[in-house]
C-alpha cells in the first residue's frame, strides 16, 4: 500500500519555490477541539510515543507541546477520565540528561513537575492531575496541537539556516 | 525554557469546537520549495530519525512520503551533491517485519527498492541515485513536507474515530 | 455483548504443558493491554502476565517466568497462555482480564472473563 | 515488590452499616490503587480505580480514599449483595501489580 497522500486538483507547475507563508489557520479543522491560540486533537486509539509523534507529524501537527501551567491545567480540564493518559511531546534526552521538548527546547524547572523516572526512553504523559513518565514503548492515547498562527513568521529555525 | 509556541493576537474563544476544515494551502511557505502537489523543506543540519521526525512534526509537517517512482525521481532531482543524504518518512517495523510509512501504510514491494538490511532500528534514506537503509541512530539530513491540499477531505482517520 | 471467555484447562501432570486461550467480544480488542491473573483454591489474587496492545510489550511475575509466554492474536481477537514446565503451584483458576483503555502500564482490571481451572497433580 | 496489607482480614456487619476496609502499601504508590468485590465462584469486580474514582455502574455507597500509603474503601451503608471478599491491587507502572491478601465481609 502506499502513503495515502492528497491529490491536488489543479496543475501546479514543478519545482517552484515560493516565499509566501503558510495561510493563517483562523478556525481549528474538523474534528479538533480549539483551545485557546491552539488546535487539540485527542486520539482514540493507543500508541507508543514514537507512533504517537508519527501519526501528529502525518496530521501535519505535534505531539502537545506545553508553554505554562495555565496550559496544562486548561489542557488537563478537557480529560474527563482520571484513569485516561495521553502522551505529550516531551521525553527524556539522554544526551543531556534532561527532559526535552520536540522542538528541542528543554523543560524549565518551573514549569511541570514530571513525577516518575528521568532515565532512558522515558517519555511525558499528562493524565486528569498530574503529568507522569513512564517508557517511551508504552501505548497510551496521545494528543496532537496545530497552532492557531494568526501571527505571520518570517524567522527560519536554525536548522534550516 | 518554555517550548517556542506562536501566541494568537486576538481573543479566541476557548474549548469551541469547531467543525471547518484546515485553509486551502495554495502556496508554500518561505522556505519551502513546491514540488508538484507538495511543499519540501531539505534540512542543512543532520540528525538520527527520530529527531528528524520531531522536527517535522513541530513544523506542522511530516518526513517526506513518497507515493511512487515518478516522485522518487523528482524528489531526487533536488539533491544536487551525490554524497548527501536524507531521511525520509519510513522505517523498519519489527513487530509487522516490514518497512512502514509513518502514516501507517506499508511498502509496496514494486515502489522503492530498498538497498540496505531490513531488520530492527533501520530507517531508510534516499541519496541522489538510490535508497538505503540504516541505522536510525545515524545522524543526517532530512526532508519534511506539507501538502498542498486543495480539495478538502473531510474523511477522519481511524485513529480518531 | 462485551465479554471474555477463557478455555484450556484441565487436569495436567507435574513438568506438563497446556494452553489456555481467551475469547474477546463486543469491544476494540486490539487496543487494549490484556492480563492474565489467577487465584488458587481458597487464597487471594495473582497477576501473572501482560500484553500490550500490539503485543510488542509483555511483562511476567517472576513466579512464571520462563516457563510461561503470554500471546495475542488481534485479527482473532484472541489472547493465549502458553503454560510449560507446570508445577503443582501452578494449580488456580486463570482468568483473563482486560485494562482500563489508556492507563498505560497502570493496569486496573475492569472486564474479566468467568476464569478456566488448571489441576496440576500427579 | 510492593507489598498490600489489608485490614481487617474478615468483618461481620448488618445490612445498613457503614463499613470500612483499609490497604496499606509498603512504599508509596501515589493514588494507583484499585479495589475489587469478589463473590465465591464468580470473577472479581472493579469498584474503583484510581483509588477513589467510582467505575462506571457501581452503586455510589462504594467510595475509595488515600494516597501514598494508606487507602479506604467504604460502603456507606451495606446492603445484602455486597457480602463478598474485597481486594486491593496496586498498579503502579512497574509490575508485580500486586494484590492485598482480601477482606471477607460476613453476615453479622
Known amino acids: 500500500q502506499k502513503p495515502s497522500i492528497g491529490k491536488c486538483s489543479v496543475d501546479i507547475q514543478q519545482n517552484r519555490t515560493k516565499t509566501t507563508e503558510r495561510p493563517d489557520l483562523l478556525n481549528c479543522p474538523i474534528y479538533w477541539q480549539q483551545v485557546q491560540e491552539k488546535c487539540l486533537l485527542f486520539s482514540h486509539t493507543v500508541n507508543p510515543w514514537n507512533n504517537s509523534l508519527a501519526d501528529c507529524s502525518t496530521k501535519e501537527s505535534s505531539l502537545l507541546l506545553i508553554q505554562d501551567k495555565d496550559e496544562l491545567t486548561r489542557t488537563q480540564n478537557l480529560i474527563h477520565d482520571k484513569a485516561i493518559s495521553f502522551w505529550i511531546g516531551l521525553n527524556f534526552s539522554l544526551s543531556e540528561k534532561n527532559w526535552k521538548w520536540i522542538n528541542g527546547s528543554f523543560l524549565s524547572s518551573n514549569d511541570l513537575k514530571i513525577t516518575g523516572d528521568a532515565k532512558e526512553n522515558s517519555c511525558v504523559y499528562i493524565s486528569q492531575t498530574s503529568v507522569y513518565s513512564e517508557y517511551c514503548s508504552t501505548e497510551m492515547k496521545w494528543i496532537c496541537q496545530k497552532e492557531l498562527t494568526l501571527v505571520r513568521n518570517k524567522v527560519s529555525p536554525d536548522s534550516w539556516l | 525554557q518554555k517550548p517556542s509556541i506562536g501566541k494568537c493576537s486576538v481573543d479566541i474563544q476557548q474549548n469551541r469546537t469547531k467543525t471547518t476544515e484546515r485553509p486551502d494551502l495554495l502556496n508554500c511557505p518561505i522556505y519551502w520549495q513546491q514540488v508538484q502537489e507538495k511543499c519540501l523543506l531539505f534540512s542543512h543540519t543532520v540528525n538520527p530519525w527520530n529527531n528528524s521526525l520531531a522536527d517535522c512534526s513541530t513544523k506542522e509537517s511530516s518526513l517526506l512520503l513518497i507515493q511512487d517512482k515518478d516522485e522518487l525521481t523528482r524528489t531526487q532531482n533536488l539533491i544536487h551533491d551525490k554524497a548527501i543524504s536524507f531521511w525520509i518518512g519510513l522505517n523498519f517495523s519489527l513487530s509487522e517485519k516490514n518497512w512502514k510509512w509513518i502514516n501507517g501504510s506499508f511498502l509496496s514491494s514494486n515502489d522503492l527498492k530498498i538497498t540496505g538490511d531490513a531488520k530492527e532500528n533501520s530507517c531508510v534514506y534516499i541519496s541522489q541515485t538510490s535508497v538505503y537503509s540504516e541505522y536510525c541512530s545515524t545522524e543526517m539530513k532530512w526532508i519534511c513536507q506539507k501538502e498542498l491540499t486543495l480539495v478538502r477531505n473531510k474523511v477522519s482517520p481511524d485513529s480518531w474515530l | 455483548q462485551v465479554q471474555l471467555v477463557e478455555s484450556g484447562g484441565g487436569l495436567v501432570k507435574p513438568g506438563g504443558s497446556l494452553r489456555l486461550s481467551c475469547a474477546a467480544s463486543?469491544?476494540?480488542?486490539?487496543?487494549?493491554?490484556m492480563s492474565w491473573i489467577r487465584q488458587a483454591p481458597g487464597k487471594g489474587l495473582e497477576w501473572v502476565s501482560y500484553?500490550?496492545?500490539?503485543?510488542?510489550?509483555?511483562a511476567y511475575a517472576d513466579s512464571v517466568k520462563g516457563r510461561f509466554t503470554i500471546s495475542r492474536d488481534n485479527a482473532k481477537n484472541s489472547l493465549y497462555l502458553q503454560m510449560n514446565s507446570l508445577r503443582a503451584e501452578d494449580t488456580a483458576v486463570y482468568y483473563c482480564?482486560?485494562?482500563?483503555?489508556?492507563?498505560?502500564?497502570?493496569?486496573?482490571?475492569?472486564?474479566w472473563g468467568r476464569g478456566t481451572l488448571v489441576t496440576v497433580s500427579s | 515488590d510492593i507489598q498490600l496489607t489489608q485490614s481487617p482480614s474478615s468483618v461481620s456487619a448488618s445490612v445498613g452499616d457503614r463499613v470500612t476496609i483499609t490497604c496499606r502499601a509498603s512504599?508509596?504508590?501515589?493514588?494507583?490503587l484499585a479495589w475489587y468485590q469478589q463473590k465465591p465462584g464468580k470473577a472479581p469486580k472493579l469498584l474503583i480505580y484510581?483509588?477513589?474514582s467510582l467505575q462506571s455502574g457501581v452503586p455510589s455507597r462504594f467510595s475509595g480514599s488515600g494516597s501514598g500509603t494508606d487507602f479506604t474503601l467504604t460502603i456507606s451503608s451495606l446492603q445484602p449483595e455486597d457480602f463478598a471478599t474485597y481486594y486491593c491491587?496496586?498498579?503502579?507502572?512497574?509490575?508485580?501489580?500486586?494484590f492485598g491478601g482480601g477482606t471477607k465481609v460476613e453476615i453479622k
Open positions: 482480564a482486560r485494562s482500563l483503555m489508556s492507563t498505560g502500564t497502570h493496569l486496573y482490571f475492569d472486564l
Open positions: 463486543g469491544f476494540t480488542f486490539g487496543q487494549y493491554y
Open positions: 500484553i500490550s496492545p500490539s503485543g510488542a510489550t509483555i
Open positions: 512504599q508509596g504508590i501515589s493514588d494507583w
Open positions: 484510581a483509588a477513589s
Open positions: 491491587q496496586q498498579v503502579t507502572s512497574f509490575p508485580p501489580y500486586t
